[in-house]
Interface confidence: low
């Protein structure tokens, strides 16, 4: 036998004290799928939450982060402090990032300046509290004749001759 | 037949936390709210908050920093904790089913706390 | 929060008279109100949802009326059962609130 419920589309719920009569849901509430027995409440975005889409009969509110935070966990559950470049967030605010670490985003933690060695690289720029060291070539990636650690001489000036 | 039965502790001392359960049969919990409802002695009713199918929870903004609702559906359980328990605590507790259009139609028999040293 | 005030908080009546219990919203809340009868011992029961639907199983003697924020919860024949309290709770916003009650006594 068909369940009666069955029958009652997103947006609305089975009132089973009504012989299963499918009822509208009540305001700021939604079902978004069909023979739902309740609706769920709608999301209120409140405080640092701002609202991006409204609730409607059908589907939830969804929330984002008022400038100046950003969102953290599923369906942006909690807003969290930005920071600076350079900087992460603890909990006495935000901080630079220690010697040796880096931050190129507004949110997450410092993170360590690769180290280029491990790759037998060298450094070629160095790193800063907003950017990753840049890694040189290693030896075996340059072409014969460019490993001479001697640096080239400099180009001369047109229009002048060597004294 | 749907039923709801309320289990607590009966006598808990100021400032601890109160933790009672709320045990449903014939009706799920991934289809129903849960709705807590207290009276304190000579008093009327008062709204604590509801837990919905989904699991999210409201609660009333008086007590909100002391109210954690909380529910095992493979259990058909639903739990009340509150902390920081004071004498203007000592009530009887109440969970009541929420259905669709959000009236209580199934309530437990309810279960008495006395908050005392 | 929405504030709901019923009056009077306690009633005497005679068997067999009308009664009428008046529940006041401190804003518009639409139809959205709720009537439950709390007998001597405890026990919670639904009357009414949604102002004026009879939940399954009430006499009805039983009815409701309003809407905004003037509500009325009528019994049209009190019998002795109807010894209790009466509550009206609203839902057009959370948090849900109850009134103050009204006792009902037998004269």
């Known amino acids: 036998l068909q369940d009666p419920c069955s029958n009652c589309p997103a947006g609305t719920f089975c009132d089973n004290n009504r012989n299963q009569i499918c009822s509208p849901c009540p305001p700021n509430s939604f079902s978004s799928a069909g023979g739902q027995r309740t609706c769920d409440i709608c999301r209120q975005c409140k405080g640092v939450f701002r609202t991006r889409k409204e609730c409607s009969s059908t589907s939830n509110a969804e929330c984002d982060c008022t400038p100046g935070f950003h969102c953290l966990g599923a369906g942006c559950s909690r807003c969290e402090q930005d920071c600076k470049q350079g900087q992460e967030l603890t909990k006495k605010g935000c901080k630079d990032c220690c010697f040796g670490t880096f931050n190129d985003q507004k949110r997450g933690i410092c993170r360590p300046w690769t180290n280029c060695s491990l790759d037998g690289k060298s450094v070629l720029v160095n790193g800063t509290k907003e950017r990753d060291v840049v890694c040189g070539p290693s030896p075996a990636d340059l072409s014969p004749g460019a490993s001479s650690v001697t640096p080239p001489a400099p180009a001369r000036e047109p229009g002048h001759s060597p004294q | 037949q749907v039923q709801l039965q309320e289990s607590g502790p009966g006598l808990v001392k100021p400032s601890e936390t109160l933790s009672i359960t709320c045990t449903v049969s014939?009706?799920?919990?991934?289809?129903?709210?849960v709705h807590w409802v207290r009276q304190p002695p000579g008093k009327g009713l008062e709204g604590l908050g509801v837990i919905w199918p989904g699991g999210s929870t409201n609660y009333n903004s008086a007590l909100m920093s002391r109210l954690t609702i909380s529910k095992d559906n493979s259990k058909s359980q639903v739990s009340l904790k509150m902390s920081s328990l004071t004498a203007a605590d000592t009530a009887m507790y109440y969970c009541a089913r929420v259905t669709g259009t959000w009236y209580f139609d199934v309530w437990g028999q309810g279960t008495t706390v006395t908050v005392s040293s | 929060d929405i504030q709901m005030t019923q009056s009077p908080s306690s009633l005497s009546a005679s068997l067999g008279d009308r009664v009428t219990i008046s529940c006041s919203a401190s804003q518009g809340i639409s139809n959205y109100l709720n009537w439950y009868q709390q007998k001597p011992d405890g026990t919670v029961k639904l009357l009414i949802y949604y102002t004026s639907t009879l939940h399954s199983g009430v006499p009805s003697r039983f009815s409701g009326s309003g809407s905004g924020t003037d509500f009325t919860l009528t019994i049209s024949s009190l019998q002795p059962e109807d010894v209790a309290t009466y509550y009206c709770q609203q839902y057009s916003k959370l948090p849900w609130t109850f009134g103050g009650g009204t006792k009902l006594e037998i004269k």
């Open positions: 014939g009706s799920s919990l991934t289809s129903y709210g």
